[in-house]
Amino acid sequence: SSPTSSASSFSSSAPFLASAVSAQPPLPDQCPALCECSEAARTVKCVNRNLTEVPTDLPAYVRNLFLTGNQLAVLPAGAFARRPPLAELAALNLSGSRLDEVRAGAFEHLPSLRQLDLSHNPLADLSPFAFSGSNASVSAPSPLVELILNHIVPPEDERQNRSFEGMVVAALLAGRALQGLRRLELASNHFLYLPRDVLAQLPSLRHLDLSNNSLVSLTYVSFRNLTHLESLHLEDNALKVLHNGTLAELQGLPHIRVFLDNNPWVCDCHMADMVTWLKETEVVQGKDRLTCAYPEKMRNRVLLELNSADLDCDPILPPSLQTS
């Protein structure tokens, strides 16, 4: 009596289907209206249907749930809590669904949830307890292994009166629930800085994507604890130079690959250590593509081709000799 078709094909639930069985409670494994379901593939797709809420009649078998391209606006506490629970749900994609608020405990009662994608949602209000589910100082560990939060920054006029970076980091660190997180993507979020404590509390990270942000410096960021880190994406930021401490930390990570393309490197005397390091290290991918942006006389010079004589700083004149 399930409308789900056999094999791996998808069955669509036509809008009239729900009314056809409307006198009875929903069948446990029926396909929600405006969704496509494949029991064989354990997959439900409710994609680009302008849904305004998470369907309450999701089939218990669902392992992969796509709710992309909708108009959900808000994920309340227990948005996916069902009786019986969605015990198999492992991958949840909510990207591009116009979410502006994710509340505490939104992903509670999903014991198998390993991958979560909230990308391309203007998250003006991300609860500190969105992922941990409780405000305890140490929460039950989240099963999440992969958290994709690319382009979740809301428009300027919709931001709360607080640091967006701080809001996101608070959610990542609450209750130390994400200790098992291996992949974290935070690309395209206009981050100006990376709070210094965030990486130290995510010791299992293998992949960290911070590309296409506005990071100017990594001076206060420590990578020392990330001994499992395999890839660090820092392309398309506003980095001017990497200082000795950062270089040493990156060099000390056994499996690391670092991506540094398209940053406005300032090729003055402060760049000497980084150039020396680049010439020796194997950790930077595509290091031959890195070029100077400033000063003007150095624009487009390849970092690897520079020598110490090229990297000078204009002397700082005493105030009495400075001209207006």
Epitope: S13, P15, A18, S19, S22, P26, P32, A33, L34, C35, L51, T52, E53, V54, P55, T56, D57, Q71, A73, V74, P76, A77
Partner: antibody, heavy 121, light 107 residues
């Protein structure tokens, strides 16, 4: 005229069943979520149940969960409430009320006149 | 569940009076607070939604304010047709809940 009209109320014994209907007219019924709200004699308002426009999102108050079933037929512009295992405390006027695009952040901007359900032996 | 507490439960006032009814939520509900008016034997009628937005056709003497947990409905100059019972209701989370009501009577 934009309106909601409830029917199906009446006297029923405890443990009995009743099915309420709400007929909508004057607006595009299939575009709106709908709710049932009740009011016991001389008491305040109590939200009972919610159903979204395509029937894939349904919520109930704890007091009726497992006993009441909300449903709708967009082709007939009708909302229903199947009430089973009725109790004395279910005695109330039952209103159907139009909601917004989701249960949260919404409001009831159109109400029916209500239908009285009396549960008594 | 979020409890909604209205005060006072009843009040007596005269035509022309300024009347204020308060509604307190047991936890924050942001701005998702609605106000209804109900007259005896009639269905409720939406006055204000999302704290302060006046429903179409509702007189401008009605206004709403507040945020978080504390909200207020104000009738700037009470008219004879305003004697009724007023309910607040939160739409922040399910179950949706109403306040106990405030009965506005003629003094």
């Amino acid at each position: 005229e934009v309106q909601l009209v409830e029917s199906g109320g009446g006297l029923v014994q405890p443990g009995g069943s009743l099915r309420l209907s709400c007929a909508a007219s004057g607006f595009t019924f299939s575009s709106y979520s709908m709710n049932w709200v009740r009011q016991a004699p001389g008491k305040g308002l109590e939200w009972v149940s919610y159903i979204n426009s395509v029937s894939n999102t349904i919520y109930y108050a704890d007091s009726v969960k497992g006993r009441f079933t909300i449903s709708r037929d967009n082709a007939k512009n009708s909302l229903y409430l199947q009430m089973n295992s009725l109790r004395d405390e279910d005695t109330a006027v039952y209103y159907c009320a139009r909601g917004g695009v989701r249960v949260l952040r919404s409001y009831f901007d159109l109400w029916g006149r209500g239908t009285l359900v009396t549960v008594s032996s | 569940d979020i409890q909604m507490t209205q005060s006072p439960s009843s009040l007596s006032a005269s035509v022309g009076d300024r009347v204020t009814i308060t509604c307190r939520a047991s936890q924050t509900i942001s701005s998702y607070l609605n106000w209804f008016q109900q007259k005896p034997g009639k269905a409720p009628n939406l006055l204000i939604y999302t704290t302060s937005i006046l429903q179409s056709g509702v007189p401008s003497r009605f206004s709403g304010s507040g945020s978080g947990t504390d909200f207020t409905l104000t009738i700037s100059s009470l008219q004879p047709e305003d004697f009724a019972t007023y309910y607040c209701q939160q739409s922040y989370s399910t179950p949706l809940t109403f306040g106990g009501g405030t009965k506005v009577e003629i003094k």
